[in-house]
């Protein structure tokens, strides 16, 4: 589903991809906070940043992507299919699977979904943050 | 008691246009589902035609014989979903009706739930 | 384009038979599949969802199986109300699957 390696894309590319992504998860979010009575979990973690933080790999992409599919097989909210579209646009072809669990319980599939589209928004933020200052950085 | 009504059916002439409603009752619009048009011509079996997400975006989705004639739209405010029909034929002819169907597996089954339908009679 | 093959389109059968539905997707719809059942006059009523979920209410008789792209619906002994026709659904919003029903069954006397 690649046309190019990742590493084809720019800076300014990469920003852009970011950019949407931030945009779609923050919608994400707002829906999945409209089930009330759900609470955060402590037991799931989405990786976000990458250690060194710099254009193309500013995220762990990949992980992300298999967290965002994972969520797919619990709902079917078309804006997820969106996220991993634009996620698809940040990894190299030959990136590994990432390995989920699914929750099987009702209430611990809604705590899942809640947890990490909450640090999927999150990671965005910082990603874009990242990014903006790093540009800034390039330019001084 | 959860609800959904359908209105707006009747006898159309062909080329003509019309407007169902589907008014929810017994709940309020929310993220948790969507809300779709399923046709059923006398006789024949269940037609899907379009789906519309309620949520922070209207997304929506048509089988690709319905793009162009028919449109869905939301009206939150009013609890309605609307299908618009445009330049109906003889074969429009059919019993339509709403349905919401769940987003997520995660939900109990309530969030299946139908009207009644409503006739649409193509006829000169 | 998406298609939901259901098969057999009639079927007959007597009272304590057991009966099996099934449905082929075009491509995986990961679980996301209902099956209905309808009676003359009638909107379509919610047996099975998520492919093996029992809906509240129906008897347990009924059961749904399959994954990716082949599911069945089952009634293990056959009761005089069973007799109607029945259609299995795909109701996934995002875009990599779609919706659409499929083209029915149905069961009636032998």
């Known amino acids: 589903s690649h046309t190019l390696p990742v590493h084809f894309l720019q800076p300014s590319d990469i920003q852009k991809i970011v950019e949407e992504l931030q945009s779609l998860s923050k919608m994400l979010l707002k829906d999945v906070k409209e089930d009330k009575g759900v609470l955060v979990s402590q037991n799931y973690t989405l990786p976000c940043l990458t250690p060194d933080a710099q254009p193309p790999n500013i995220i762990h992409s990949p992980a992300i992507r298999a967290y965002l599919k994972t969520i797919r097989q619990l709902d079917n909210k078309s804006v997820i299919d969106e996220i991993i579209e634009h996620l698809d646009k940040l990894i190299f072809q030959d990136a590994p699977e990432t390995n989920i669990s699914v929750p099987t319980d009702t209430h611990e599939c809604k705590r899942f979904i809640l947890t990490i589209s909450q640090q999927f928004s999150e990671c965005m933020d910082l990603a874009l943050k990242s990014l903006t200052s790093g540009a800034q950085q390039a330019t001084t | 008691q959860s609800q959904l009504v359908e209105s707006g059916g009747g006898l159309v002439q062909p080329g003509g246009s019309l407007r169902l409603s589907c008014a929810a009752s017994?709940?309020?619009?929310?993220?948790?589902?969507?809300i779709c048009w399923v046709r059923q011509a006398p006789g024949k079996g269940l037609e899907w035609i379009v789906c519309?997400?309620?949520?922070?975006?209207?997304?929506?989705y048509y089988a690709p014989w319905a793009k162009g004639r028919f449109t869905i739209s939301k009206d939150n405010s009013k609890n309605t979903v609307y299908l618009q029909m445009n330049s109906l034929r003889a074969e429009d002819t059919a019993v339509y009706f709403c349905?919401?169907?769940?987003?997520?597996?995660?939900?109990?089954?309530?969030?299946?739930?139908w009207g009644q339908g409503t006739l649409v009679t193509v006829s000169s | 384009a998406f298609q939901l093959t259901q098969s057999p389109s009639s079927l007959s059968a007597s009272v304590g038979d057991r009966v099996t539905i099934t449905c082929q997707a075009s491509?995986?719809?990961?679980?996301?599949l209902a099956w209905y059942q309808q009676k003359p006059g009638k909107p379509p009523k919610l047996l099975i969802y998520?492919?093996?979920k029992l809906a509240s209410g129906v008897p347990s008789r009924f059961s749904g199986s399959g994954s990716g792209t082949d599911y069945t619906l089952t009634i293990s002994s056959l009761q005089p109300e069973d007799f109607a026709t029945y259609y299995c659904?795909?109701?996934?919003?995002?875009?990599?699957?779609?919706w659409g029903f499929g083209t029915g069954t149905k069961v009636t006397v032998l």
């Open positions: 659904q795909t109701y996934y919003g995002g875009g990599h699957i779609g």
């Open positions: 349905a919401r169907f769940s987003s997520g597996i995660y939900d109990l089954d309530r969030f299946f739930l």
């Open positions: 998520q492919a093996s």
């Open positions: 519309i997400y309620i949520g922070s975006r209207a997304d929506t």
């Open positions: 491509q995986s719809i990961e679980s996301w």
């Open positions: 017994g709940f309020s619009f929310s993220a948790n589902y969507w």
